[in-house]
């Protein structure tokens, strides 16, 4: 029961996290114009991974895609890549984890297979969360660097004085959404990995006992039931006909609670 709850909760937390990563990636507010010196400015700029927008106090908004830039910064491309990789891995992880859920029965899928799938999806969620956190952190680092570099410059141009006053940018809402979402996906992944351990108990080999059938020299030998995390050939009980073989240690033993009669 605890395993099912842990797995289910891990799935839900990861689902929320991945939805948040998708939302953050699509959001335009990755960086926002810092209004420290002009809180009632009529025109306000904010930027995302895909476009830059201008909003006015009147409600007018105009957005332009980054294709107008002569050369996109490598940092922006890296952040885009990290976020997309995070989304793709998360989506695959969700797909795998649906089939791995203990509460869902698909054919005759064994616990060992579900354990493997749970572990796989858990690892995918962890990597997905780390990608999102890394992407957001790289962008945040760029903003912090730019914030302190933004100074007032004055230089002489070809036709007279040309003054450029830098405007500072600060963290947008998308950064916080991304950090929280990445953290949730990471936590969900860890929960899935913990659930995997519960789904797959420690490997146990039970002693096989042979029983002589009356009038026949044929023994029924349960094939050493083996619970493991792998897809081994010894995961089902097999009848082995070995011409009246004794127990594995050649000593007749009496039936125990583990024996099959």
């Amino acid at each position: 029961m605890a395993v099912t709850a842990c797995q289910g909760l891990g799935f839900v937390v990861s689902l929320i996290g991945i939805a948040g990563i998708i939302a953050a990636t699509c959001m335009d507010q990755w960086s926002t114009q810092d209004l420290y010196n002009n809180p009632v400015t009529a025109v306000f700029n904010y930027q995302g991974l895909w476009r830059s927008c201008v909003r006015e106090s009147s409600g007018f908004t105009e957005c332009r895609g980054y294709f107008t830039l002569l050369g996109l910064p490598a940092m922006l491309q890296a952040v885009r890549a990290l976020m997309i990789v995070g989304i793709v891995l998360g989506a695959i992880g969700l797909l795998v984890s649906i089939f791995a859920l203990k509460c869902i029965r698909i054919g005759s899928m064994e616990d060992s297979a579900k354990a493997n799938m749970t572990l796989t999806s858990g690892i995918m969620f962890i990597v997905s969360g780390l990608c999102a956190i890394a992407g957001v952190s790289v962008f945040a680092n760029m903003l912090v660097t730019n914030f302190w570099m933004s100074t007032a410059n004055m230089y002489t141009g070809m036709g007279g004085m040309v003054q450029t006053v830098q405007t500072r940018y600060t963290f947008g809402a998308a950064l916080f959404v991304g950090w929280v979402a990445g953290g949730l996906t990471l936590i969900g992944g860890v929960m899935m990995c913990i659930a995997c351990r519960g789904l797959a108990p420690e490997e146990t080999n039970y002693k096989a006992v042979s029983y002589h059938a009356s009038g026949h020299s044929v023994a029924y030998k349960p094939g050493g039931f083996k619970a493991s995390t792998g897809f081994g050939s010894n995961t089902k009980n097999k009848k082995i006909y070995d011409g009246g073989a004794r127990t594995e240690d050649e000593v007749q033993s009496y039936p125990s609670k583990h024996d099959y009669v």
């Epitope: 960086s31 114009q33 009529a42 025109v43 700029n45 930027q47 830059s52 927008c53 201008v54 006015e56 009147s58 409600g59 007018f60 105009e62 332009r64 980054y66 107008t68 830039l69 002569l70 910064p73 940092m75 922006l76 760029m142 903003l143 730019n146 040309v162 003054q163 450029t164 006053v165 830098q166 405007t167 940018y169």
Partner: nanobody
Framework: QVKLEESGGGLVEAGGSLRLSCVAS????????MGWYRQAPGKQRELVAT???????NYADSVKGRFTISRDNAKNTVYLQMNTLRPGDTAVYYC??????????????WGPGTQVTVSS
């Protein structure tokens, strides 16, 4: 880099009209507020008119009703239509723009200016 270039200035008689243009070129993402300022000889640079991307305009009291500012966002251009010109309007007219030119990069830029002379 970003460059602002004015055009349309010249010599005109009092009561005449002129149309100034200013185009922003270079690596531009968004143009925020664009405007016109002027500086007469021996005087401080003063605001003439400004326009936001949404079309909100602001004028100096001395030019209200005579000058009209407009902008074409698609062409990154701002215009100043000057009617009923007076000798007191003689000055160097400068174009100004708040330009978003990169990722978390925004600056306030000035053009080199264009001379407008109104003769009496």
């Amino acid at each position: 880099q970003v460059k602002l270039e004015e055009s349309g200035g010249g010599l005109v008689e009092a009561g005449g009209s002129l149309r100034l243009s200013c185009v922003a070129s270079g690596s531009i993402l968004n143009l925020m507020t664009m405007g016109w300022y002027r500086q007469a000889p021996g005087k401080q640079r003063e605001l003439v008119a400004t326009a936001t991307p949404g079309g909100t305009t602001n004028y100096a009291d001395s030019v209200k009703g005579r000058f009209t500012i407009s902008r074409d966002n698609a062409k990154n251009t701002v215009y100043l239509q000057m009617n009923t010109l007076r000798p007191g309007d003689t000055a160097v007219y400068y174009c100004n723009a708040d330009v978003v030119y990169g990722l978390a990069r925004q600056g306030n830029y000035w053009g080199p200016g264009t001379q407008v002379t109104v003769s009496s």
